[in-house]
């Protein structure tokens, strides 16, 4: 139900709270217009209703909130702050709601929020403090355990003059608030690289999905700290080869399963270590499906069937013998 008391003692980072107050107390736990509510299932669904704001009168019992397929555009600070707070809200799905701006403190005052899905929103402006709620160097820990950010890359003409990867990573690392995060999905975001410090600061990760990006190399990425990692999805990227350091780190993770399908593997002399490792390791799922993309003579060859004689590099000619 809606708050009815003054919000003056509340954080100023939640300006919406103070004004989202019904003039008269609504019926207890009534369902907002355009939404479907099940108190038994603790679920509210406001789906495909072209909402431009988060409903103000959300029932206090809500544990699962679906706000998918709307036109929210912007989530301001305190977008879900209510009096009394939505203390039970554990799963929030905002996918496909045309969000392009998520501000600092957008998810403040949701003490039980464990799952957040922002997928399929063109997030041109994701505040570094969207998840941490404050610009302190160390923030209060976020309760988030699962963060789904698949296909949040905006169209190229709407991206700002900054690295999209950098913007996302800044939000993930701010204030070290997401130390308890166990699942992170970042699929389909056109990532060209993975900033080297991101994984080291998310030590609780069990599941990491980076599939359908444009990652060319993992050379500078360290998986060493991710001792709990159970699944690593790297399908449909632009990976050419995994080098020894990466192979050793992956092999050293006790529970890991790695998915590497549909990458343009380059089967030359630099691939020898990876082929040897693939033949011995159990961590790669569907490793028998991995095939060469380059060079042309090796296209569609199965990596597991290669031997060292297959993996050669064209000799580099001295400059005096190179033609222009």
């Amino acid at each position: 139900s809606s708050p009815t008391s003054s919000a003056s003692s509340f954080s100023s980072s939640a300006p919406f709270l103070a004004s989202a107050v019904s003039a008269q107390p609504p019926l207890p736990d009534q369902c907002p217009a355009l939404c479907e509510c099940s108190e038994a299932a603790r679920t509210v669904k406001c789906v495909n209703r072209n909402l431009t704001e988060v409903p103000t009168d959300l029932p206090a019992y809500v544990r699962n909130l679906f706000l998918t397929g709307n036109q929210l555009a912007v989530l301001p600070a305190g977008a879900f702050a209510r009096r009394p707070p939505l203390a039970e809200l554990a799963a929030l799905n905002l996918s496909g709601s045309r969000l392009d701006e998520v501000r600092a403190g957008a998810f403040e005052h949701l003490p039980s929020l464990r799952q957040l899905d922002l997928s399929h929103n063109p997030l041109a402006d994701l505040s570094p403090f969207a998840f941490s709620g404050s610009n302190a160097s160390v923030s209060a820990p976020s309760p988030l355990v699962e963060l789904i950010l698949n296909h949040i890359v905006p169209p190229e003409d709407e991206r700002q003059n900054r690295s999209f990867e950098g913007m996302v990573v800044a939000a993930l690392l701010a204030g070290r608030a997401l130390q308890g995060l166990r699942r992170l999905e970042l699929a389909s975001n056109h990532f060209l690289y993975l900033p080297r410090d991101v994984l080291a600061q998310l030590p609780s990760l069990r599941h990491l999905d980076l599939s359908n990006n444009s990652l060319v190399s993992l050379t500078y990425v360290s998986f060493r700290n991710l001792t709990h990692l159970e699944s690593l999805h790297l399908e449909d990227n632009a990976l050419k080869v995994l080098h020894n350091g990466t192979l050793a780190e992956l092999q050293g993770l006790p529970h890991i399963r790695v998915f590497l399908d549909n990458n343009p593997w380059v089967c030359d002399c630099h691939m020898a270590d990876m082929v040897t490792w693939l033949k011995e390791t159990e961590v790669v799922q569907g490793k028998d499906r991995l095939t060469c993309a380059y060079p042309e003579k090796m296209r569609n060859r199965v990596l597991l069937e290669l031997n060292s004689a297959d993996l050669d590099c064209d000799p580099i000619l001295p400059p005096s013998l190179q033609t222009s």
Epitope: P15, F16, A18, S19, A20, S22, P32, A33, L34, C35, C46, R49, N50, L51, T52, E53, V54, P55, T56, D57, Q71, A73, V74, P76, A77, D100, E101, R103, A124, D125, E158, Q160
Partner: antibody, heavy 120, light 111 residues
């Protein structure tokens, strides 16, 4: 042509109530959020309240919170403002206005206003 | 609450001359996606009318002698060549957060 026509204003004593209406025509009323904005005599503009297109969101200025209630009836293309416990400082011309959304929107159509005078 | 301060409070400009009105916000009202600042014109005895949305976008039907600029905290409304019908009070308004607030208004007259 977009038209917004306010009614229901008048002279009322402090502590009493009044209900304003705003009749909309010339556009699909149910697709737009609506605001009330007021203007005290000789003064500037003051935002009062907002209601979303489907009555899922309601916001109020601190000066009216707990006393005023905004509502709408999309079947009648009408916006309402129920004003209780009126005070002298509520004396103003009250305008209804249309918007496409709360934050990403703006007041792109206005009514002519209705005058509320709170006086003993 | 965000305070919008307009300057000057009143302005007298000759016909055909340029008129400039400023609006300063007490905090930024721009993001990299959108600028949450709009301008209105109110003639005597009439309701306000939207002139400029999102700092610089001319509302349909508004003469192109009106223009807006600015971002962050500082914004400007310019009338490039003042006409007699431009005599009015001009207001800026933000939509960054609740409560929405207006500037105090600038009264524009003909010199």
């Amino acid at each position: 042509e977009v038209q917004l026509v306010e009614s229901g204003g008048g002279v009322v004593q402090p502590g009493r109530s009044l209900r304003l209406s705003c009749a909309a025509s010339g556009f699909t009323f149910s697709n737009f959020g609506m605001h009330w904005v007021r203007q005290a005599p000789g003064k500037g503009l003051e935002w009062v309240a907002y209601i979303s297109s489907g009555s899922t969101s309601f916001y109020y200025a601190d000066t009216v919170k707990g006393r005023f209630t905004i509502s709408r009836d999309n079947s009648k293309n009408t916006l309402y403002l129920q004003m209780n416990s009126l005070r002298a400082e509520d004396t103003a011309v009250y305008y209804c206005s249309r918007t496409n959304s709360l934050l990403r929107g703006f007041f792109d159509a206005w009514g002519q206003g209705t005058t509320v005078t709170v006086s003993s | 609450d965000i305070v919008l301060t307009q300057s000057p409070d009143s302005l007298a400009v000759s016909l055909g001359e340029r008129a400039t009105i400023n609006c300063r916000a007490s905090q930024s009202v721009s993001s990299s996606s959108y600028t949450y600042l709009h301008w209105y014109q109110q003639k005597p005895g009439q309701p306000p009318k939207l002139l400029i949305k999102s700092a610089s976008n001319l509302e349909s039907g508004v003469p192109d002698r009106f223009s807006g600029s600015g971002s962050g905290t500082d914004f400007t409304l310019t009338i490039s060549s003042l006409q007699a019908e431009d005599v009015a009070v001009y207001y800026c308004q933000h939509s960054w957060e609740i409560p929405l607030t207006f500037g105090q208004g600038t009264k524009l007259e003909i010199k």
